[in-house]
């Protein structure tokens, strides 16, 4: 599934524009606040009464090759006393981001962006009750 | 740059790691084709920790919208919908990759950006530090 | 082809509410926010809102903040838009209309049909 | 609230006449979006960001401006530009538009 077109003309292109051949754009992967880090409360992964676990994804033909993924622990939430309480549910967040796929077709490479969908952890939620008639 | 596994058979003239700069197809492919359909987006509401989601609209970026998560109290709702400050509702931070026009306003140029964005909240138990 | 389809016309009293919905079709619901606009009788356009139907977030015109509730179902791609506390100057054309999340400068580029909400005693 | 006013709120022309239509906001936007609406339709998106034609729209159609002053011009006025246009700021909340210009062919 395809989604429309990135970068069409707006304003008025200024002259500093580089050129760039038709149907495709040129990106500079030389990533923007490369050194910044995440301030995130400690381990909350753990703390959560929605805890969750990390797998890192890493493909080699992905920039960046590696992609960290969050997956629930428990269906149900974490209760003052340390267990599971099934009337409430984990449920996962997720967030879209962007990466660089390299394309081997022969000898000759392409590249492709593409949109991912990253689970960055989970929450404690209500569940939604469906009544039967 | 990241190594790339390469076909034995093609010159060695190729970089083995991504170059700085790439032109890339003007599609973007969507790899979350059928997202999970149990995905909702009433969580924000029914969370222990809820959240209200902001605007923020960049034209220089892509994607030019993006709606960030803002915790709505310091505590967690209990079962009885109250607040319960013994508990804490935090944020999720996570750093994702956008594109940034560059130079501005460029229509086919762009930088790759990364940003911090809170997703959601989630109720966490406090740490507790012991004064001496 | 892009379709947004709203629902037909309503007459209310007032003091109640009206929900007008707007069925998408012809492209990926979740690309797009939805924004609402509506246009008194013989007047200009006024901005209600937005809802993003992704992620659920919604901003509002301060106007209309605490009446309007914006609304969508991903389920079945349409989005709905509840006025409550309705009174005569509420009497307009109300439209839908989705706007590009990733590209902006695109603008509200398809407009549903218009719904026409008349409140009259 | 930014404010935008359009000039002229009626206009009587003869085709193949220039028009010009302004808009100025009451303060500065990064770009000016244009509507066109004819009786019981809903509006067009006719211009965006600022110099864009939307497609399907003339070429006798041109945008342009920047701060506060933006203008749609029509080159050679034919009998089906008659409408209401519309000026639309999404720079600063609310999202506001011009009261609009309403166009009729003499």
């Known amino acids: 599934r395809k989604i429309p077109k990135v970068g069409h003309t707006f304003f008025q292109k200024p002259e500093s524009c580089p050129p760039v051949p038709g149907g495709s754009m040129k990106l500079d992967i030389g990533i923007i606040n490369e050194n910044q880090r995440v301030s995130m409360s400690r381990n909350i992964e753990s703390r959560s009464t929605s805890p969750w676990n990390y797998t890192v994804t890493w493909d080699p033909n992905r920039y960046p090759s590696e992609v960290v993924q969050a997956q629930c622990r428990n269906l149900g939430c974490i209760n003052a006393q340390g267990k599971e309480d099934i009337s409430m549910n984990s449920v996962p967040i997720q967030q879209e981001t962007l990466v660089v796929r390299r394309k081997h077709q022969g000898c000759s490479v392409s590249f492709q962006l593409e949109k991912v969908l990253v689970t960055v952890g989970c929450t404690c939620v209500t569940p939604v009750i469906h009544h039967v008639q | 740059g990241i190594t790339i596994p390469r076909n034995p058979g093609c010159p060695n003239s190729e970089d083995k790691n991504f170059p700085r700069t790439v032109m890339v197809n003007l599609n973007i492919h969507n790899r979350n084709t059928n997202t999970n359909p149990k995905r909702s987006s009433d969580y924000y509401n029914r969370s222990t920790s809820p959240w209200n989601l902001h605007r923020n609209e960049d034209p220089e970026r892509y994607p030019s919208v993006i709606w960030e998560a803002k915790c709505r109290h310091l505590g967690c709702i209990n079962a009885d919908g109250n607040v319960d400050y013994h508990m804490n509702s935090v944020p999720i931070q996570q750093e994702i990759l956008v594109l940034r026009r560059e130079p501005p306003h460029c229509p086919n140029s762009f930088r790759l950006e990364k940003i911090l964005v809170s997703v959601g909240c989630t109720c966490v138990t406090p740490i507790v530090h012991h004064v001496a | 082809e892009v379709q947004l389809v709203q629902s037909g016309a309503e007459v209310k009293k007032p003091g109640s509410s009206v929900k007008v919905s707007c069925k998408a079709s012809g492209y990926t619901f979740t690309d797009y926010e939805i924004h609402w606009v509506r246009q008194a009788p013989g007047q200009g356009l006024e901005w209600i809102g937005v809802?993003?139907?992704?992620?659920?977030?919604?901003f509002y015109n301060q106007k209309f903040d605490g009446r309007a509730t914006l609304t969508a179902d991903k389920s079945t791609s349409t989005a709905y838009m509840e006025l409550s506390s309705l009174r005569s100057e509420d009497t307009a054309v109300y439209y839908c209309?989705?706007?590009?999340?990733?590209?902006?400068?695109?603008?509200?580029?398809?407009w549903g049909q218009g719904t026409t909400v008349t409140v009259s005693s | 609230e930014i404010v935008l006013t359009q000039s002229p709120d009626f206009q009587s022309v003869t085709p193949k006449e220039k028009v010009t239509i302004t808009c100025s906001a009451s303060s500065s936007i990064s770009y000016i979006y244009w509507f066109q609406q004819k009786p019981d339709q809903s509006p067009k998106r006719w211009i965006y960001a600022t110099f864009e034609l939307a497609s399907g729209v003339p070429s006798r159609f041109s945008g342009s401006g920047s701060g506060t002053d933006y203008t749609l011009t029509i080159n050679s006025l034919e009998a089906e530009d008659a409408a209401t246009y519309y000026c639309?700021?999404?720079?600063?909340?609310?999202?506001?538009f011009g009261q609009g210009t309403k166009l009729e062919i003499k």
């Open positions: 209309t989705r706007y590009y999340r990733y590209e902006s400068f695109y603008g509200m580029d398809y």
């Open positions: 809802n993003d139907p992704e992620s659920g977030g919604t």
């Open positions: 639309h700021q999404r720079s600063s909340y609310p999202w506001t």
